[in-house]
């Protein structure tokens, strides 16, 4: 079957996100991938969106993330825009209104995005073949 345009958008956004490091990409998020054996694909997308939403809601105007220079501030704003787009697209792909995120495990945002990118690329390779 045809790859969803949203999936392509997600991969492009993840590529952009993982290329850039900011003051906040080393901060931690809930690692939903640590124990996702019995989780459906849609639940995984929904939970990933929830984690991203929690992150940017908490850190959007966080002074630690805003930085001391204009360039750091600009990069942080771009990071937030990318995260919001990613959240929006994952939520659309999931088609679920809400999903619990209860894991205790943590990972850095950077590692979380890399793991998500791997999952999305695998999904893309399956649907495009």
């Amino acid at each position: 079957h045809k790859c969803d345009i949203t999936l392509q958008e997600i991969i492009k956004t993840l590529n952009s996100l993982t290329e850039q490091k900011t003051l906040c990409t080393e901060l931690t998020v809930t690692d939903i991938f640590a124990a996702s054996k019995n989780t459906t694909e849609k639940e995984t997308f929904c939970r990933a969106a929830t984690v991203l939403r929690q992150f940017y809601s908490h850190h959007e105007k966080d002074t630690r993330c805003l930085g001391a220079t204009a360039q750091q501030f600009h990069r942080h704003k771009q990071l937030i825009r990318f995260l919001k787009r990613l959240d929006r697209n994952l939520w659309g792909l999931a088609g679920l209104n809400s999903c619990p995120v209860k894991e205790a495990n943590q990972s850095t945002l950077e590692n979380f995005l890399e793991r998500l990118k791997t999952i999305m690329r695998e999904k893309y390779s399956k649907c495009s073949s």
Epitope: K12, H74, R81, K84
Partner: antibody
Amino acid sequence: QVQLVESGGGVVQPGRSLRLSCAASGFTLSSFGMHWVRQAPGKGLEWVAVIWYDGSNEYYADSVKGRFTTSRDNSKNTLYLQMNSLRAEDTAVYYCAREGSWSPDIFDIWGQGTMVTVSS
Amino acid sequence: AIQLTQSPSSLSASVGDRVTITCRTSQGIRSALAWYQQNPGKAPKLLIYDASSLESGVPSRFSGSGSGTDFTLTISSLQPEDFATYYCQQFNSYPVTFGQGTRLEIK
């Protein structure tokens, strides 16, 4: 100061083409998605198109799909809208707009607009 | 495409009044909604994004609320410069769409 300036509007006959330009200053164009929004005389706002910050994605309103193309030259800090097969219903003020600083696909900086009149 | 319905389409009020404009979407968009103000012959101006976040430089008398399908823009105490047309816009998915507008006039 952050600014967008459109140009290229005018009167054109139905079926003809026109290219609008939008010159950006005061910010790095390559960091932002850019949109075109239009407003017919006495009417509301209608979104026309978006091009992602790096030019990798473009989306269009159904009303212009296949006729309009947006492009960008980040080295010249300029956005373009190529309008082909123009129709009377394309008559409007055309605005270019920058995506929001904190959210994608909202418009925090707008140009002053350029009027396009399609008439025989 | 997601449709947006604003109400009322026009509204008469006086300086100092509290005014509320509503925007309803044809499907759930969580908080992916923005509000704009437009004066005649001018470009629109962003007021609110993410349903309730106030854009930098916008007076605090403007506020937004809601999520899902029902949203409101409130002006707590109307000032003379607030008489204009207001638009809501969804950015949950392409195509981006606007409400039909609410014209706010002096009573």
